[in-house]
């Protein structure tokens, strides 16, 4: 299964820690992806270590653990964020976070 | 049936540098990641780097960072391995693999290309 | 990084005979583990992935298993056209790495 905070907050300019949790008794993880809305903005597996989308690049630091780092937040960076993780034997699981980025006070 | 056909054998000098292409016949580089391996004569497999080419993005071993450049062009499904500053010990048959991304990430390295033959020599 | 250690470095057979590779890691890496067979001459070639699934296209004679830091590669019944390298690999920890290989000869 797959846990996490399904609505966060932060603050304009600032950062945020995306992170999906996951627990199985039998199934191993070989590739998190992390998606916002529908365009990939993360992949990490161990043959491959972290990979991020070059137009992310400069405000997405991977981590800590399998999450990532969102900076410099920007009121467009407001929607849905996606991790899936893929797992052998076990299949496709996915968390789904709301992120609200509030102007600074 | 996806192959990885690799550009030919090379003889280079000490100090210069050799770039092996590896292309995608028949198919493309969509979910799939490229790894480098290389073999020096008489010795086993070790693991240079890695590219993602719908990022474009590369990792490398400690060993071979800041020497090796893997590249992709998603245009013509080809990645390219760059080595620099070459020495003797790099001597060795390099190959490109294929590594699937998503949901098939387990299946390791499924498809070799045939190997690139670099001899470096004064 | 994470050694892996294999055993024998060598070893002859005969046609017939069943076979046990070992691989050993320097720590636990669960059950990510591959095999892979490599002639003279030719790339290497995926035999098992996840330390026990079997490729596909890839006679039953060959099975894997273990998990954490042993593992094992089995020829039920070796075949004329098994003799060959045998290296096992770990992607539980990046970056990837191999061990020093098996050489099964013919006895």
């Known amino acids: 299964t797959i846990d996490t905070k399904r609505n966060i907050s932060a603050e304009e300019g600032g950062s945020v820690i995306l992170q999906c949790h996951f627990s199985s008794d039998t199934a191993e993880v070989t590739q998190v992806d992390w998606k916002q809305q529908d365009q990939l903005l993360a992949i990490y597996s161990v043959d491959l270590g972290w990979h991020v989308a070059s137009v992310f690049s400069d405000r997405v630091v991977p981590g800590p653990s399998l999450g990532l780092t969102f900076q410099s937040l920007t009121m467009n960076d407001t929607g849905e964020y996606f991790c899936t993780y893929h797992t052998y034997p076990g299949g496709i699981y996915k968390g789904r976070i709301f992120l609200k980025v509030q102007e600074s006070s | 049936q996806v192959q990885l056909v690799q550009s030919g054998a090379e003889v280079k000098k000490p100090g210069s540098s050799v770039k092996v292409s590896c292309k995608a016949s028949?198919?493309?580089?969509?979910?799939?990641?490229i790894s480098w391996v290389r073999q020096a004569p008489g010795q086993g497999l070790e693991w240079m780097g890695v590219?993602?080419?719908?990022?474009?993005?590369?990792n490398y071993a400690q060993k071979f960072q800041g020497r090796v450049t893997v590249t992709a062009d998603e245009s013509t499904s080809t990645a390219y391995m760059e080595l620099s500053s070459l020495r003797s010990e790099d001597t060795a048959v390099y190959y490109c693999?294929?590594?699937?991304?998503?949901?098939?990430?387990?299946?390791?390295?499924?498809?070799w290309g045939q190997g690139t033959t670099v001899t470096v020599s004064s | 990084d994470i050694q892996m250690t294999q055993s024998p470095s060598s070893l002859s057979a005969s046609v017939g005979d069943r076979v046990t590779i070992t691989c050993r890691a320097s720590?636990?890496?669960?059950?990510?583990l591959n095999w892979y067979q490599q002639k003279p001459g030719k790339a290497p070639k995926l035999l098992i992935y996840?330390?026990?699934s079997l490729q596909s296209g890839v006679p039953s004679r060959f099975s894997g298993s273990g998990s954490g830091t042993d593992f094992t590669l089995t020829i039920s019944s070796l075949q004329p056209e098994d003799f060959a390298t045998y290296y096992c690999?770990?992607?539980?920890?990046?970056?990837?790495?191999f061990g020093g290989g098996t050489k099964v000869e013919i006895k």
């Open positions: 693999a294929r590594l699937h991304l998503g949901q098939k990430a387990y299946y390791g390295m499924d498809v």
């Open positions: 028949g198919g493309t580089f969509q979910n799939y990641a």
């Open positions: 590219i993602v080419p719908i990022f474009g993005t590369a």
């Open positions: 720590q636990s890496i669960s059950s990510y």
């Open positions: 996840a330390a026990s």
């Open positions: 690999q770990q992607r539980y920890v990046f970056p990837p790495t």
